[in-house]
Interface confidence: low
């Protein structure tokens, strides 16, 4: 007769580190004491005639557990295979690159480490929740790859990678092991550099907005913009309208930059710059400043007048010009009663990169003069009828200006002077019409001959 | 760690020409602007002039124009500042310094590299 | 040139006293952008300069608060310190940024009493 000898349990599943309790049984009536063979760690629990129950601990590794016994001195023996099953230890997505151009292919990579038995775990690649690719667990430590195109919408989108052991067979159900979620930043460069907006001059001390636009940018708000004069940094405000990026700062020449410049704006987006430049030139105009030896003058005296301005201006004054550019312009006169109120014009130009600007200037010369009477507006005889309306055309002039009264010989009747008045006979005689000012005084004789008119 | 590390001390002959460099990191090169400064007994600091290594634009104290050359090498990040005709005037520590546009002050400073010109 | 005239020349002082320091222009180092690029830098013996406040009032990072105050405006500006330790012995120097060329005051040693 053939006895057996069973092992139970048949084929157990477990997890790595787990402990299994083993029984050997025999139906040999004489058989001996029950033996186990295997590498794992065991203890004999309990033992009977026929039977012997252990506890295998620590199970690390898929074994194979052998159970003999001499049964009327021959061996019969028993196996039982034992499955282990380990969830990774580790699934790591790898880090995507820091920006991604969009119509480009990259690459999802993603390693794990551990995990059995192979023939069970499968890797997931995803895209949110949408699975990219799907493929076995391979080599240790088994790495999954993937080609994606990238696009606008996966700007922002979590990529992430997901194991599955699957021990569903085996009665015990997936388990689902899921990476740190990587986040994608997808852009569009265009290939155009910016359009520059910027002043082709620029004088010392003044200031003239620059405007910097890059048209199919993708995503705008994310792009830097750095926009310079020279070397100095210009404060940009930037604004974002859907695609388009506009940098506006203000430009302000200092005058250690004077001389040839560039504005320098440089946009950049996913570690690509593109960069438009334009050649400025930071000018200094000074002037003109026209001075006058005296702004208020005595007849008589000599008074110089000089224009000037900054280096490389041409001036010209009164239609003279300077010996050079950078040199002054000057002239001299003799001040006379007819230069008092005088101005003389200066005009400046600079030639900037073959461009000519123009700045003028003025002032006016004050001459101090004695009082006169124009004898040609102050008739020194008059005849007037009585009871007439009429103006004593009398004008005086002078610096400072005079004051005129006509006054009657031998009284101190004063007639009115440039305004109309009744005329009569008390009117008639000889008249002193006198101009003072601070500069003396000038008299002038006017007779009034007065017709009575005729009685009826 | 941002870090300006200048070469070593240097003897030198009246006359003779002398390099010294700058070597950036921590930060992008071309993001600042490098300066140099001279420091000796009699005359304390004094501002040599800046460079721009992005676009290798200078600047000049009118008083070392002709004595100091500055140049920028961006692929090591490496500033360097050559001294012509030296006589013994020039002995000092020199540094290299950079600012941000903002601040505008020298944030950082090299250790600084003593000249020695004597006969 | 913008001259930068530093008073006092040397500063003795003890542990923990407050110390002032004086820092004056030939001209304005008022910009016509209306910033005013007047910085403070301290030199250790040994060592390079450092720098310690930008722009009149503005500390640099990681300097200690008791570098409080810088102040001033135009031509006039001061340094204080609150409380001084042993680190902070060395060379005191005003520099402005204003005018081309850049220029520096002559130091203000602070010393140990």
């Known amino acids: 007769q053939e006895f057996l000898l069973r092992v139970e349990p048949q084929n157990p599943v477990l997890s790595a580190g787990g402990s299994l309790f083993v029984n050997c049984s025999t139906d040999c009536p004489s058989s001996e004491k029950i033996a186990l063979e295997t590498s794992l760690s065991k203890e004999l629990v309990a033992s009977g005639m026929g039977w012997a129950a252990f506890n295998l601990s620590n199970v690390t590794g898929n074994s194979r557990i052998l159970c003999s016994v001499y049964c009327n001195g021959s061996q019969i023996t028993g196996s039982s295979n034992i499955t282990v099953y380990r969830l990774p230890e580790r699934v790591e997505l790898a880090p995507l690159p820091p920006w991604q151009p969009v119509g480009q292919n990259f690459t999802l990579r993603c390693q794990v480490e551990d995990g059995s038995p192979r023939t069970s775990l499968t890797v997931v690649l995803l895209r949110w929740e949408e699975e990219l690719s799907r493929q076995p667990a391979v080599e240790e430590p088994a790495e999954v790859t993937a080609t994606v195109l990238a696009s606008r919408d996966d700007h922002g989108a979590p990529f992430s990678c997901r194991t599955e052991l699957d021990m569903q067979p085996q009665g015990l159900g997936l388990f689902v092991n899921t990476s740190a979620p990587r986040q994608l930043r997808t852009f569009v460069l265009p290939v155009t550099p910016p359009r520059l907006v910027a002043p082709r001059f620029l004088e010392v001390e003044t200031s003239w907005p620059v405007d910097c636009t890059l048209d199919g940018l993708f995503p705008a708000s994310e792009a830097q913009v750095y926009l310079a004069l020279g070397d100095q940094m210009l404060n940009a405000t930037v604004m974002n309208h859907g695609d388009t990026l506009t940098a506006t700062a203000t430009a302000t020449a200092r005058a250690d930059q004077e001389g040839a410049r560039e504005i320098v704006c440089n946009v950049t987006l996913g570690g690509e710059r593109r960069e438009a430049r334009e050649n400025l030139t930071v000018f200094s105009f000074l002037g003109p400043i026209v001075n006058l030896s005296e702004p208020t003058a005595h007849e008589g005296s000599t008074v110089t007048v000089s224009c000037m301005a900054g280096a490389r201006v041409q001036v010209t004054l009164d239609g003279v010009p300077a010996a050079a550019p950078g040199q002054p312009a000057q002239l001299q006169l003799n001040a006379t009663e007819s230069d008092d109120g005088r101005s003389f014009f200066c005009s400046a130009t600079l030639e900037v990169d073959g461009e000519f600007l123009h700045r003028n200037s003025s002032v006016q010369l004050r001459v101090l003069y004695g009082p006169k009477i124009d004898r040609a507006t102050c008739p020194q005889h008059l005849k007037w009828k009585d009871k007439t309306r009429h103006v004593l055309q009398c004008q005086a002039r002078g610096n400072p200006y005079p004051e005129l009264r006509c006054l009657k010989e031998g009284s101190s009747r004063e007639v009115p002077v440039g305004i109309p008045f009744f005329v009569n006979v008390t009117h008639n005689g000889t008249y002193q019409c006198q101009a003072s000012s601070s500069r003396g005084k000038y008299t002038l004789v006017v007779v009034m001959d007065i017709e009575a008119g005729s009685s009826h | 760690e941002i870090q300006l590390q200048q070469t070593g001390p240097e003897l030198v002959k009246p006359g003779a020409s002398v390099k010294i460099s700058c070597k950036a990191s921590g930060y992008s090169f071309t993001d600042c602007i490098i300066l140099w400064v001279k420091q000796s007994h009699g005359k304390g600091l004094e501002w040599i002039g800046k460079i721009n290594p992005y676009f290798g634009t200078t600047t000049y104290n009118l008083k070392f124009k002709g004595k100091a050359t500055l140049t920028v090498d961006k692929s090591s990040s490496t500033a360097h500042m050559q001294l012509n005709s030296l006589t013994s005037e020039d002995s000092a520590v020199y540094y290299c310094?950079?600012?941000?546009?903002?601040?505008?002050?020298?944030?950082?400073w090299g250790q600084g590299t003593s000249v020695t010109v004597s006969s | 040139d913008a001259v930068m005239t530093q008073t006092p020349l040397s500063l003795p002082v003890s542990l923990g006293d407050q110390a002032s320091i004086s820092c004056r222009s030939s001209?304005?180092?008022?910009?016509?952008?209306?910033?005013?690029?007047l910085h403070w830098y301290l030199q250790k013996p040994g060592q390079s300069p450092q720098l310690l406040i930008y722009?009149?009032?503005?500390r640099f990072s990681g300097v200690p608060d008791r570098f409080g105050s810088g102040s001033g405006s135009g031509t006039d500006f001061t340094l204080k310190l609150s409380r001084v330790e042993a680190e902070d012995l060395g060379v005191y120097f005003c520099s402005q940024s204003t005018h081309v060329p850049y220029t520096f005051g002559g130091g203000t040693k602070l010393e140990i009493k």
């Open positions: 310094a950079r600012k941000e546009a903002y601040p505008d002050a020298m944030d950082y």
């Open positions: 722009k009149v009032s503005n």
């Open positions: 001209q304005s180092l008022v910009h016509s952008n209306g910033d005013t690029y």
